[in-house]
């Protein structure tokens, strides 16, 4: 299953399959997730080691048993790959690292006014993988405001150095935020020239294209079909690059197929997995296990559940079958692709779905009438769980926020439905940033069921929580995916990085905002909060957040939306925007429904509604 916990001051011994430099443990974990054989990783922050060569070292590891012995190492961080973790699987990494220079091949230098502008330039340059920016206070005046675009053979820095007044980060192309746009076309009977960066075997051009998309240096590809004249080159997928970023030449060639990486697509990237099953095809590789199962789909599920399995063949040969069950060969290779592809066999083959980010149909957990005051504009995909709850009567308007917690589930505030309990009048918009982008053609979800907490009473602040079951499940994308829920009764975690988002008023007597707003707000203890609200009872099932001096808060139209906190690199839904005295007033924090206190209720309702477990714990 999915394991998300990080081990501090611990280092996994042995099992090394690759090593690289990464700026933090989360990026190291992402590289482990996308490496075909990595199950575990260990990361050495700069503070944990004196050896300059090993600083920022990210060590990717494999283990037949799925685990390795941990040794104590002060400052080291270790953890698991996020294979099998559904919507948490993403190659998108937005963080910017201050005081760090990520080294690589500098191929472009320009003057820009901010690190964000530098990241944007990197994202809009086809060859840029990461960048460094020298701030206005950099010690050498001639380098100030320099934006260096970089690449490396592996897509990660060749070295990382601690350097004051330098900020570094990665291209946001994997976040589907590139302005370049992509070529969806596949060209039959055409071979591209240029430099081959890798060679793998694939059953068709689609798998070849997806592998190219997620390979750090592949910009385009040529695939040799199973009818290609040279038998030893059949089903070969050549991953390619060039100095210019485009093929320098192409040659008409029967039974070849060429195309481009889809990494520069805007708003939509292919999933990093291959779900198609190939009948009459045998995938060769190292044998991991052989099991008897009923049907090729069960064979694929078995492969997906066995974390080291990369691909499989389900044999229908009479000698491989007993009654209704046949042999399911679970296999792996060094590069995650078959070492041999044979056609016309009595079997069907396919790939593990361990990197599919749709995951299962569950919500994610771990083991007012109140817009954002004092906030700033959000960017695409920053808060992909945020939804807009809109009511269409004569006109249509935004009323509340909400949080996507599963394919078919939204969590919001109960008071959003005061006087509007009819599910037919509601429209739920997900995967949006600007309300003005909504037209009559914009897809929306309709409500199948509104589940208001049984103890909620109108105009009282208690139990202000409601679940919405959508009529149809939503697909997950970089712009539309769920937020993880906290553990039941989560009281021990100290959250220091919390944000509230919404389209609500920007001042008490304001109006709904067009661009989704975000504001960083510290949590306030319940004791402190109670002092500020002496006329109300602040219960243990509430959580408060706000600045003593005010100025930043949720407001009307944000109700039902998320209060999320980042802990160990993972966002969790800590609160639901509920109520407050005015907006952003001095010493009047916002009050939020504490989600951890309602985990039993959420579990019960999401399970009973479907008759099967809807909750999944990555822990």
């Amino acid at each position: 299953g999915c394991l998300t916990q990080l081990y501090e001051n611990a280092f996994f011994r042995g099992g090394d399959v690759a090593s690289m430099y990464t700026p933090n443990a989360q990026y190291c974990q992402m590289r482990c997730t996308f490496h075909p054989r990595c199950l575990l990783f260990s990361f050495l922050p700069a503070s944990s080691i004196n050896d300059m060569e090993k600083r920022f070292g990210c060590f990717l590891k494999d283990s037949v048993t799925g685990t390795l012995p941990k040794v104590h190492r002060t400052g080291a961080v270790s953890g698991h790959s996020l294979k099998q973790c559904g919507h948490q699987i993403s190659a998108c990494h937005r963080d910017i690292y201050k005081g760090v220079d990520m080294r690589g091949v500098n191929f472009n230098v320009s003057k820009v006014s901010s690190v964000e502008e530098c990241q944007k330039r990197c994202t809009s340059n086809i060859r840029c993988q990461f960048f460094s920016y020298a701030t206005q206070t950099f010690h050498k005046a001639e380098y100030r405001n320099n934006c260096l675009l970089k690449y490396s053979p592996g897509g990660t820095p060749t070295a990382i150095k601690v350097l004051s007044n330098v900020e570094s980060g990665f291209s946001l192309k994997p976040c589907a935020l590139s302005e370049i746009g992509c070529h969806m076309n596949i060209f039959q009977h055409l071979a591209f020239s240029d430099v081959d960066v890798a060679r793998v075997l694939t059953p068709d051009a689609f798998v070849c294209r997806t592998i190219c998309t997620y390979h750090p240096n592949c910009l385009f590809f040529t695939f040799y079909t199973n009818v290609w004249k040279i038998e030893s080159q059949r089903n070969v997928c050549l991953l390619k690059t060039s100095e210019s970023g485009t093929p320098s030449s192409s040659t008409p060639q029967e039974n070849t197929i060429s195309g481009y990486s889809l990494l520069t697509c805007k708003r939509t990237l292919p999933e990093p997995c291959h779900s198609k099953i190939y009948p009459g095809v045998d995938f060769g590789g190292e044998e991991l296990n052989v099991t008897f199962v009923k049907g090729v789909n069960v064979c694929q599920e078995t492969c997906t559940k066995m974390i080291r399995c990369q691909f499989f063949t389900y044999s229908l040969l009479p000698e491989d079958c007993k009654e209704e069950k046949c042999k399911c060969f679970l296999r792996l290779s060094m590069d995650g692709s078959p070492t041999r592809i044979a056609y016309g066999t009595q079997g069907s083959s396919g790939y593990s779905l361990r990197l599919c980010n749709t995951g299962d149909n569950s919500v994610c957990t771990t083991k007012t009438s109140t817009r954002i005051v004092g906030g700033t504009n959000s960017s695409w995909g920053e808060w992909p769980w945020q939804v807009s709850l809109q009511v269409k009567l004569t006109a249509q308007r935004h009323l509340c926020g909400g949080s996507l917690i599963g394919h078919q589930w939204v969590l919001t505030a109960a008071h959003c439905f005061d006087g509007l309990p009819l599910q037919d009048v509601w429209r739920i918009y997900s995967g949006i940033l600007n309300l003005s982008d909504i037209t009559k053609d914009t897809p929306f979800s309709q409500i199948k069921e509104i589940i208001i907490h049984q103890n909620y009473k109108v105009s009282e602040g208690n139990h202000d929580i409601a679940l919405i079951k959508l009529q149809a499940p939503l697909n997950y994308t970089e712009f539309q995916k769920p937020i993880c829920l906290p553990s039941k009764g989560d009281t021990s975690t100290i959250y220091t990085n919390c944000w509230v988002t919404g389209w609500g008023f920007s001042k008490e007597k304001g109006e709904i905002q067009n661009i989704l707003q975000k504001v960083n707000i510290p949590l306030v203890t319940n004791e402190e909060c109670q002092k500020r609200y002496q006329d109300y009872k602040i219960t243990q099932r509430m959580v408060c957040a706000g600045y003593k001096e005010g100025g930043k808060d949720a407001c009307k139209g944000d109700s039902g939306g998320p209060l999320v906190c980042k802990h160990n690199g993972m966002w969790r839904l800590v609160g639901i925007t509920s109520w407050g005295e005015g907006c952003a007033r001095r010493e009047q924090p916002g009050v939020y429904t504490k989600v951890a206190e309602y985990m039993d209720w959420i579990l019960e309702k999401t399970q009973s509604s479907d008759g099967k477990a809807q909750m999944q714990s990555p822990a």
């Epitope: 969806m184 076309n185 596949i186 039959q188 068709d204 051009a205 689609f206 695939f223 079909t225 199973n226 009818v227 039974n255 197929i257 292919p270 779900s275 198609k276 099953i277 009948p279 009459g280 056609y343 016309g344 066999t345 009595q346 697909n475």
Partner: antibody, heavy 119, light 107 residues
Framework: EVQLLESGGGLVQPGGSLRLSCAAS????????MHWVRQAPGKGLEWVSW????????EYADSVKGRFTISRDNSKNTLYLQMNSLRAEDTAVYYC????????????WGQGTLVTVSS | DIQMTQSPSSLSASVRDRVTITCRAS??????LNWYQQKPGEAPKLLVF???SLQSGVPSRFSGSGSGTDFTLSISSLQPEDFATYYC?????????FGQGAKVEIK
């Protein structure tokens, strides 16, 4: 030039049998997946069956499973469809078609042969 | 089996009109989606494969888009020779089902 030429169609009584042939030329027949697709009069296209290059793997639509058999003779560059226990609803134009390797489309079609099942 | 649903099933249009036909799959088929054109008395002809890739020799006024479950075939400026029936087909899993067809007629 790729050419596919179907033959063997005609009038047959319900319960009867018929064998369709498709002569292929202009490409290396032995390397390609081949399909049969049919179209009832005034209706849409219906995929019937396919066969892998070596003949080692075949698949059928549920509507013909157990009654139709696809086969090929690579030495003669010919594709066959043996149709048994024919029913009135099998009346259609039957097309022989070539699979486009690596992309899963049908890139070349024959002109079709009409099979009429009627008493 | 995967069901393919096309809409509209028929439409009337004039020369130089822009025409869009949609195809919806009952489950995600990635980009394993092809479009064919068929004229009366003729065999079908491949127009678009892999959802958006134009088959060699097909005029550039034809274009395809989509992935997952929703796909479209567009003709930017309808020509007299484009009046025909258009079929979508999925090749994601067998049986390789076709849509019911969309007939483009002269207005």
């Amino acid at each position: 030039e790729v050419q596919l030429l179907e033959s063997g169609g005609g009038l047959v009584q319900p319960g009867g049998s018929l064998r369709l042939s498709c002569a292929a030329s202009g490409f290396t027949f032995s390397g390609y997946i081949m399909h049969w697709v049919r179209q009832a009069p005034g209706k849409g296209l219906e995929w019937v069956s396919w066969i892998y290059p070596s003949g080692g793997w075949t698949e059928y639509a549920d509507s013909v499973k157990g009654r139709f058999t696809i086969s090929r003779d690579n030495s003669k560059n010919t594709l066959y469809l043996q149709m048994n226990s024919l029913r009135a609803e099998d009346t259609a134009v039957y097309y022989c078609a070539r699979d486009a390797p690596g992309v899963g489309a049908i890139d070349y079609w024959g002109q079709g042969t009409l099979v009429t099942v009627s008493s | 089996d995967i069901q393919m649903t096309q809409s509209p099933s028929s439409l009337s249009a004039s020369v130089r009109d822009r025409v869009t036909i949609t195809c919806r799959a009952s489950q995600s088929i990635s980009t394993y989606l092809n479009w064919y054109q068929q004229k009366p008395g003729e065999a079908p002809k491949l127009l678009v494969f892999a959802a958006s890739s134009l088959q060699s020799g097909v005029p550039s006024r034809f274009s395809g888009s989509g992935s997952g479950t929703d796909f479209t075939l567009s003709i930017s400026s309808l020509q007299p020779e484009d009046f025909a029936t258009y079929y979508c087909q999925q090749s994601y899993s067998t049986p390789h089902t076709f849509g019911q067809g969309a007939k483009v007629e002269i207005k």
